[in-house]
C-alpha cells in the first residue's frame, strides 16, 4: 500500500481547470524530495508532465503548475484549459517516476452536457456580468424580443421588450434593442448568481418565422488561489472586482464552518478584533481594486478568505468575489521576536525588527498602525534617516545587529506611545511584522537631567545614573540626529572591578563637552547595550547660550525636568503614493524633518564613567 494518497478519479469538462491534491507522509526526506505528475503510456512508462523542480512539459506549457506544501505534506497539481486529450491515467508521486512513492489517478475530461446545435456558451464567475447576444432577421425587427430560461421541458420568461422582468432578475437585467440596421439584441445580466446557471433561449418574433438562439450560461464560483505564507510573516490579498463595483463598499471576510463569511475588515470601518494592530485595507485605485495586508500571521489565520463588494460591506449572493485559501507554515523562516514590548512612562523601548537577511541593502522602515477607518500606517522613521517631526530626539532606526534584524529605539515614552507598530522594508513584503508597545507602571532605569543649558566655550558635564543590573552592560552616550545616533568617543571608564562589585559610587556614566560650541546644541542619549543588542536609553536636550558666567557648568542628575519644547525645523513634505502594497510607506502622506546638521566634534566630547563624588556633590 503506497503512503501517497490522492483522488482516484477526477472528472471535468473541456475548457475547465482541475486542482489535484496529493498527500504524502511529511517526513523530512519526503518534504524536500522531488514531486511529480506523470502520464502513464501504453508501454507502462510514466512521462513527467510537471515537477516540483520547475519542469513543465511542452504539452502543459502555460497551463499547469505543481506547488509543494511541505508542512502540510501535500502538493497540488493545477491543470487549466482541459481538453478531451487530457483524459487518461496519471500518477502523482515523490522521488523518481519509475520507483518511488506514487498514487494512480484517472482523469476523465468530457464534452460537457449535450447542447442544441449553435448554442453559444458563456462562462462567467458569480457576481459578474454577462451579455447574451441574440441575432434576428429583418422581418422580426418590429416584433417582440424575449429571453427564456429552459427548466426541464418548460421555458420560463426572463425578460422581454414589453417591459416584463422575471422577479428573480429584478434590478439586475436589461434588454437592449439597437438602432435600425443592427440585427442583434442583447440581454445584460449583472450580479450573476449560481442559480442563474443554465440554458437560455433568445427569441424574436413568434410563429414559424421566429428567430431563436440558444445560450448556455455557466456561472462558476471563483477558484480560490492557494496562498502559502510563513508564521509571523505577512500576506497581501490583491482584490480586483471590476469597474462595475468601483464605488461600492469593499470587504474581506473569512469563511466559517457554517459556510457564512465573517467580515475581517471593510471600507465601512468594521474590523475583526482578532486582527487589531495587524491589518490594513489600502485605498482603492480608480478601477476599484484594493489590497488587504495582514501581518503577524498566526496558525489560526488559516482558512478561506473572500473579498467582495456590497453596499452593506459584507458578503451577499450575486455580487462579485475573489477567493484565497491561506495556509500558514509553522516551519517559518521568520525568526521569533517579541510581539509585545513593555516600557515605562519617561523610559524607552528597543524593538528588534526582522527582515529578509538576503536583503541587507533594503531600506528599513517603522510605522505606527492607526485603526481609524480602513487603517493606515504612517512612517515614523526610515533607515535613510527621515524621522517624523514629533519624534525628533526620541526615535532612531539602527542597522544593528544586522544579518536579518534591525533595531528601533523610542524613548521619552508617554501613554500616547502605546499601540501597534510595524517593521517593514522596501524588499520582501512577506517579512512585515507587528509589535505592540505597552506602557506599564514603573520608573525609568536610566536617570538624566531634563533641561540642560550649556555655555559657549565652557565645559559641560552631563551625568547618567544607571542601576546595578546594568553594571555588566556597555554604557554609551551618543548625539542624536535624524540619520541615527552618533556614539561619542569614550574616555577611561574607571576600574572595571568597581562595576563588577557594583559600588554605589560607580553607577554613573558622564558626557563631557569641552569646549561647548554651537554645533553641540541638540539631543543626547545615554544608553546601555550588550554587543549589538541595545537596551534602555534616556534623552537629554542641550541648549547652547552665550557666555554669562565664567567656569564649568555641572548639572544635577536629580533635576529631571521634562525636555524642552522641540525645535521647529524646516519640514519637507513628502507625497506618499497609494500604490499601497508595493509602496512600503503604507497609505500615508507624512511630514519629515531635514537633517539637523553636524555631529558634535570628536575630540571635544568625551564620555566618562566615574563616581558621583567626582561630580562635586551635585547629586546630593
Amino acid at each position: 500500500k503506497s503512503p501517497v494518497f490522492g483522488p482516484q478519479e477526477v472528472s471535468s469538462v473541456e475548457g475547465n481547470s482541475v486542482s489535484i491534491k496529493c498527500y504524502y507522509p511529511p517526513t523530512s526526506v519526503n518534504r524536500h524530495t522531488r514531486k511529480y505528475w506523470c502520464r502513464k503510456g501504453a508501454s507502462g512508462r510514466c512521462i513527467t508532465l510537471v515537477s516540483s523542480e520547475g519542469y513543465v512539459s511542452s504539452n502543459y506549457a502555460g497551463r499547469a503548475n505543481l506547488t509543494n506544501f511541505p508542512e502540510n505534506g501535500t502538493f497540488v497539481v493545477n491543470i487549466a484549459q482541459l481538453s478531451r486529450d487530457d483524459s487518461g491515467h496519471y500518477k502523482c508521486g515523490l522521488g523518481i517516476n519509475s520507483r518511488g512513492l506514487s498514487f494512480d489517478v484517472s482523469l476523465e475530461v468530457s464534452q460537457g452536457p449535450e447542447l442544441p446545435n449553435g448554442t453559444e456558451v458563456y462562462t462567467v464567475d458569480v457576481g459578474r456580468t454577462v451579455t447574451i447576444k441574440c441575432p434576428f432577421k429583418t422581418e422580426n425587427a418590429p416584433k417582440t424580443k424575449a429571453l427564456y430560461k429552459k427548466i426541464g421541458q418548460t421555458s420560463v420568461l426572463v425578460i422581454d421588450s414589453r417591459n416584463y422582468v422575471n422577479p428573480n432578475y429584478k434590478d439586475r437585467i436589461r434588454l437592449r434593442i439597437p438602432g435600425t440596421g443592427q440585427l442583434i439584441f442583447t440581454v445584460v445580466i449583472d450580479r450573476l448568481r449560481l442559480s442563474d446557471h443554465g440554458l437560455y433561449l433568445c427569441q424574436a418574433g413568434d410563429g414559424s418565422n421566429r428567430d431563436e438562439k440558444n445560450a448556455d450560461l455557466q456561472v462558476l464560483e471563483p477558484e480560490p488561489e492557494l496562498v502559502y505564507e510563513d508564521l509571523r510573516g505577512s500576506v497581501t490579498f490583491h482584490c480586483a472586482l471590476g469597474l462595475e463595483v468601483a464605488n461600492v463598499a469593499k470587504f474581506l471576510c473569512r469563511v466559517n464552518s457554517r459556510e457564512t463569511c465573517d467580515v475581517v475588515i471593510n471600507t465601512l470601518g468594521k474590523r475583526d478584533s482578532a486582527f487589531e494592530g495587524r491589518i490594513l485595507l489600502n485605498p482603492q485605485d480608480k478601477d476599484g481594486s484594493f489590497s488587504v495586508v495582514i501581518t503577524g500571521l498566526r496558525k489560526e489565520d488559516e482558512g478561506r478568505y473572500l473579498c467582495g463588494a456590497h453596499s452593506d460591506g459584507q458578503l451577499q449572493e450575486g455580487w462579485p468575489i475573489q477567493a484565497w485559501q491561506l495556509f500558514v507554515n509553522e516551519e517559518s523562516t521568520i525568526p521569533r521576536s517579541p510581539t509585545v514590548v513593555k516600557g515605562v512612562a519617561g523610559g524607552s523601548v528597543a524593538v528588534l525588527c526582522p527582515y529578509n537577511p538576503k536583503e541587507s541593502q533594503s531600506l528599513k522602515y517603522w510605522c505606527l498602525w492607526e485603526g481609524a477607518q480602513n487603517g493606515r500606517c504612517p512612517l515614523l522613521v526610515e533607515s535613510q534617516g527621515l524621522v517624523q517631526e514629533q519624534y525628533e530626539g526620541r526615535l532612531s532606526l539602527l542597522q544593528e545587529p544586522g544579518n536579518g534584524t534591525f533595531t528601533v529605539i523610542l524613548n521619552q515614552l508617554t501613554t500616547q506611545d502605546a499601540g501597534f507598530y510595524w517593521c517593514l522594508t522596501n524588499g520582501d513584503t512577506r517579512w512585515r511584522t507587528t509589535v505592540e508597545i505597552k506602557i506599564i507602571e514603573g520608573e525609568p532605569n536610566l536617570k538624566v537631567p531634563g533641561n540642560v543649558t550649556a555655555v559657549l566655550g565652557e565645559t559641560l558635564n552631563i551625568p547618567c545614573h544607571f542601576p546595578c543590573k546594568f553594571s555588566s552592560y556597555e554604557k554609551y552616550w551618543c548625539k542624536w540626529s535624524n540619520t541615527g545616533c552618533q556614539t561619542l568617543p569614550s574616555q577611561d571608564e574607571g576600574p572595571s572591578e568597581a562595576f563588577v562589585n557594583c559600588d554605589e559610587n560607580s553607577r554613573l556614566v558622564s558626557l563631557t563637552l569641552n569646549p561647548v560650541t554651537r554645533a553641540d546644541e541638540g539631543w543626547y542619549w545615554c544608553g546601555v547595550k550588550q554587543g549589538h543588542f541595545y537596551g534602555e536609553t534616556a534623552a537629554v536636550y542641550v541648549a547652547v547660550e552665550e557666555k554669562k558666567v565664567a567656569g564649568s557648568r555641572y548639572v544635577s542628575p536629580a533635576k529631571a525636568d521634562a525636555a524642552p519644547d522641540e525645535k521647529v525645523l524646516d519640514s519637507g513634505v513628502r507625497e506618499i503614493e497609494n500604490k499601497a502594497i508595493q509602496d512600503p510607506r503604507l497609505f500615508a502622506e507624512e511630514k519629515v524633518v531635514a537633517d539637523t546638521g553636524d555631529q558634535a566634534g570628536g575630540s571635544r566630547a568625551s564620555v566618562d564613567s566615574s563616581s558621583s563624588e567626582e561630580q562635586g556633590g551635585s547629586s546630593k
Partner: nanobody, 127 residues
Amino acid sequence: EVQLVESGGGLVQAGDSLRLSCAASGRTGSSGAMGWFRQGPGKEREFVAALMWRNTVTYKYYEDSVKGRFTISRDNAKNTAYLQMNSLKPEDTAVYYCAADPDTYGDPRNSGAYDYWGQGTLVTVSS
C-alpha cells in the same frame, strides 16, 4: 445548517450488493465534500470513500480495501450522495456514516475535516 440522513443499510450475504444514500438538506453550494466513514464492532471510525466537487469538477477518493468494489457518486439535483457497495465481505460489517463539508481543502480521509454528520446506518454482511 446542513442535515444529513442516511438510508439503505441492512443485512446481506457475502458477495451481495447494497446501495447507501445520504440526503442533504439545507444549503449546499457549487463546491463541497461528502464522505462515507464506517465503524465496525469494537473498532475506530475509518474512512471509506469521499467525493469533492467544485463547479464542474469532481474528485473521488477511496480507501485501499474498497477500491474497485465501492463507488461513490452524487445526484446534484437531489442533493444526495450514494455509496454503491459490490462484492461485500463480512469485514465490511459496520455502521456507515455520511459526512459533509462546504469546504474542499481538508484531507478527505480525516473525519475532523467534515462539519456535518448523519446518524449512521447499519450494514451487516453474513458469511
